[in-house]
């Protein structure tokens, strides 16, 4: 028949070519002479000339070694004619397949590999994966199947198999306990590619597995006892700076320190941070520290890390013994803001106060007095005692000086410290009101027609406060009462002035005297400008001139 | 000569607690990871639970996980197993062993849990 | 149901050989040489007769000797004793949080 079996041909054939494969036979050759000829890629297309037929005898033939990497299979077509160039069969299909021959090492896909495992992990833990190809067959045969093998590991530390890799996938594992990234940061491991499942070409590449930090090191004090000197009252003051060991990984979570004050500060005095770049603890005062009330404080300090440890590790505490230095402080004012009531207008030399100022410091020290600012300058103030005495009239209603019935004075002190301190203290002179003023009445200046007049409706005021203000009363003195009325309204705040009698024009005075409910009397003179007009008017109207 | 010795076993009813000890010598303990693996009575070896040297890294088998603490006290030489929520099925002999390289070296005698009402 | 496979007994006569199997996967047995095996007398703590397939401990008898293929490792016992009755188990390294796998153990009978 017409047909052929698929032929195997190893790759790498070492000759003599042309080399017979098979021989293509028509039964028609019993009546007629055939020639033969073969098509397709490896015959008369690319790669052409690999084979070729005998054209008489049908003989294939394979013309040089081939290359199952290359192509792996060959697909042709036979063909059969007389000689008169007539096909005598159908084209035939002839398959030519390429067998493999282990004739490819594998080759890694990188020369290096690059992993990272946690220290401290358990064995079976996953670390990278390794690959290496092979392009010879691994389907049909072992030729292309890979083993992969751990050849060695660098540094042998804690011991020489710390490792192992998955024979089939190439993936690393760790083996054994003891990564300590402290002791070990890197391993460098030759592995090993293996064809035929691990018996036959090798090759190697290297593996660094890189040791990845854990917080598995507490931060640990270096000095653990310091002593150190602080003056009283600094605030934000730098204390001391601690000093710390971390064998982690530097400027990690689990090297930088957190630093707690554990106890020692009762009155919540000090504070510590880290410095970013030292990794030390500043130690600084948050307040101003009293040398009088306690000259020591003995501090205790634990460290730990900004990453939580991931075993149970001991805290390093540090003693710090902070002396408290002494220092000239001033004297302060008690209370620092004095609030006096004293009534206004008493007596030159009269007494007002007594204000004084104790000293911080232990020692004894002799405190004098004097006034800082009297904007009136009506108070002294003895330097020895503090007594402050009247100098001048307290006037409530001096607007200038006085607000809100306030009159405010700021004293000094100062201690025979070497070098002096002064404090400053504020004495407010609340100032108890006495009726010394009478009522005024405004406006002081009327004008009113003298015929059909309108009343005139003045206000009252006092400087004073109640009760020495309203209600008040009006009397008309001097004869002013032959032509005018003055009464006081119900309220009693306002004054109604009333012409009477007829008067020509002509500008009078108005004699009225106004007394308080303390019958405090204040005389005013009203000058009243009398127009020849009726009812209401502002300003007389100027004599008539005819045109 | 290496050295383990459980103790902590006992009867215990279903839903209570036990924790188990395990004191080493002999050996670097800090460099050894261990491991609590149990035998049901007449049944074959089941392993529990691992911890690394450190104390850093643990394992647990699902049949626990959630009710059974691993942890390890490097400065007393000593492995603990925190069993909580004891069912009648944990009912075994434990035993601690430090694990090597690719297995279990050295072992403990055992001790017996007994989870019954 | 274990992760290694052993035979439930074996039984041989003394001074005659025996083998026990321990059928795991490509991704234990078959993928690191790292089998070992237990002998565990009746009320006593298993001990290490095996380790890295083929590798003895100090002090275990070289009558004890492993091999592997594939996805199979075998311990082999030679010149059978009346000691060596006991359970044994085969013992599989594997990547991951389960990185020991047991064998369900074999009880050896010295007939």
């Known amino acids: 028949d017409w047909v052929v079996a698929p032929i195997s041909v190893p790759e790498n054939g070492k000759g003599p070519f042309p080399q017979r494969l098979n021989q293509l036979k028509s039964n028609k050759d019993r009546d007629t002479k055939i020639f033969y000829s073969i098509t397709g890629p490896g015959a008369d297309s690319p790669p052409e000339g690999v084979f070729a037929v005998e054209k008489e005898t049908g003989w294939l033939l394979l013309n040089k070694p081939l290359d199952r990497e290359e192509i792996a299979k060959y697909e042709l077509f036979g063909h059969a004619v007389s000689e008169n160039g007539a096909s005598v069969e159908d084209p035939m299909n002839i398959s030519i397949i390429v067998t493999d021959q282990n004739d490819h090492k594998p080759k890694f896909t990188q020369d290096t590999f690059r992993g990272s495992v946690l220290e401290g992990v358990l064995p079976g833990t996953s670390v990278m994966q390794v690959t290496a190809t092979d392009e010879d067959d691994a389907i049909y045969t072992y030729n292309g199947v890979v083993a992969y093998s751990i050849h060695s590991q660098e540094p042998k530390d804690p011991h020489d198999l710390m490792f192992t890799i998955h024979r089939s996938t190439g993936t690393i594992s760790v083996i054994s306990s003891g990564l300590d990234r402290e002791k070990v940061p890197e391993y460098t491991l030759t592995i090993q590619a293996t064809d035929m499942d691990g018996d036959g070409s090798t090759t190697t590449a290297v593996a660094v597995v890189e040791i990845l930090d854990a917080n598995d090191n507490a931060p640990m004090f270096d000095p653990q006892k310091y002593e150190a000197h602080v003056p009283e009252n600094a605030v934000g003051h730098e204390v001391q700076r601690l000093t710390v060991t971390d064998l982690d990984a530097p400027n990690s979570p689990a090297w930088r320190a957190t630093y707690l004050i554990m106890g020692g500060d009762d009155g919540d005095h000090f504070t510590i941070t880290t410095h970013p770049e030292s990794n030390q603890g500043i130690l600084t005062t948050r307040k101003g520290l009293d040398f009088e009330a306690k000259n020591q404080h003995t501090l205790y300090v634990e460290v730990t890390n900004e990453a939580p440890f991931v075993l149970k590790l001991p805290t390093s505490t540090a003693t710090i013994v902070v002396h408290v230095e002494d220092v000239n402080e001033a004297p302060v004012f008690v209370p620092p803001s004095k609030v006096v009531e004293v009534q206004e207008g008493i007596p030159t030399g009269e007494p007002v106060c007594v204000y004084t100022a104790e000293d911080p410091d232990k020692e004894n020290q002799k405190i004098s007095y004097r006034i800082l600012r009297d904007p009136a300058g009506w108070l002294a103030m003895d330097p020895d005692s503090g007594q402050v005495t009247a100098v001048g009239t307290l006037d409530r209603e001096d607007e200038q000086f006085v607000r809100n019935n306030i009159y405010e004075v700021m004293v000094l002190a100062m201690d025979n410290g070497s070098p002096p301190t002064t404090g400053t203290g504020t004495l407010l002179l609340t100032l108890i009101d006495v009726n010394d003023h009478g009522p005024v009445p405004e406006p002081r200046q009327i004008t009113i027609c003298n015929q059909s007049p309108v009343r005139q409706v003045l206000n009252i005021t006092d400087k004073d406060l109640s009760p020495h203000t309203s209600p008040f009363q009006a009397q008309l003195t001097d004869d002013s009462d032959i032509y005018w009325t003055a009464e006081v309204n119900e309220e009693g705040d306002t004054v109604v002035l009333s012409l009477k009698k007829f008067l020509k024009q002509d500008t009078y005075d108005v004699h009225l005297s106004l007394s308080d409910h303390g019958n405090k009397e204040q005389l005013t003179v009203i000058r009243a400008t009398v127009c020849d007009c009726h009812g209401h008017v502002e300003t007389c109207p100027g004599p008539w001139k005819g045109g | 000569e290496v050295q383990l010795l459980e103790s902590g076993g006992g009867l215990v009813q279903p839903g209570g607690s036990l924790r188990l000890s395990c004191a080493a010598s002999?050996?670097?303990?800090?460099?050894?990871?261990m491991s609590w693996v149990r035998q049901a009575p007449g049944k074959g070896l089941e392993w529990v639970s691992a911890i690394s040297g450190s104390g850093g890294s643990t394992y647990y088998a699902d049949s626990v996980k959630g009710r059974f603490t691993i942890s390890r006290d490097n400065s007393k030489n000593t492995l603990y197993l925190q069993m909580n929520s004891l069912r009648a099925e944990d009912t075994a002999v434990y035993y601690c062993?430090?694990?090597?390289?690719?297995?279990?070296?050295?072992w403990g005698q055992g001790t017996m849990v007994t989870v019954s009402s | 149901q274990s992760a290694l496979t052993q035979p439930a007994s074996v039984s041989g006569s003394p001074g005659q050989s025996i083998t026990i199997s321990c059928t795991g996967t490509?991704?234990?047995?078959?993928?690191?040489?790292?089998v070992s095996w237990y002998q565990q007398h009746p009320g006593k703590a298993p001990k290490l007769i095996l380790s890295e397939v083929n590798k003895r401990p100090s002090g275990v008898s070289n009558r004890f000797s492993g091999s592997k293929s594939g996805n199979t490792a075998s311990l082999s016992i030679s010149g059978l004793q009346a000691e060596d009755e006991a359970d044994y188990y085969c013992?599989?390294?594997?990547?991951?949080?389960?990185?020991?796998?047991f064998g369900g153990g074999t009880k050896l009978t010295v007939l």
């Open positions: 062993a430090s694990w090597g390289t690719g297995q279990h070296e050295n």
């Open positions: 002999g050996f670097t303990f800090s460099s050894y990871a």
């Open positions: 013992s599989s390294f594997t990547s991951g949080s389960t990185f020991n796998l």
């Open positions: 490509s991704n234990d047995v078959g993928a690191y040489n790292y």
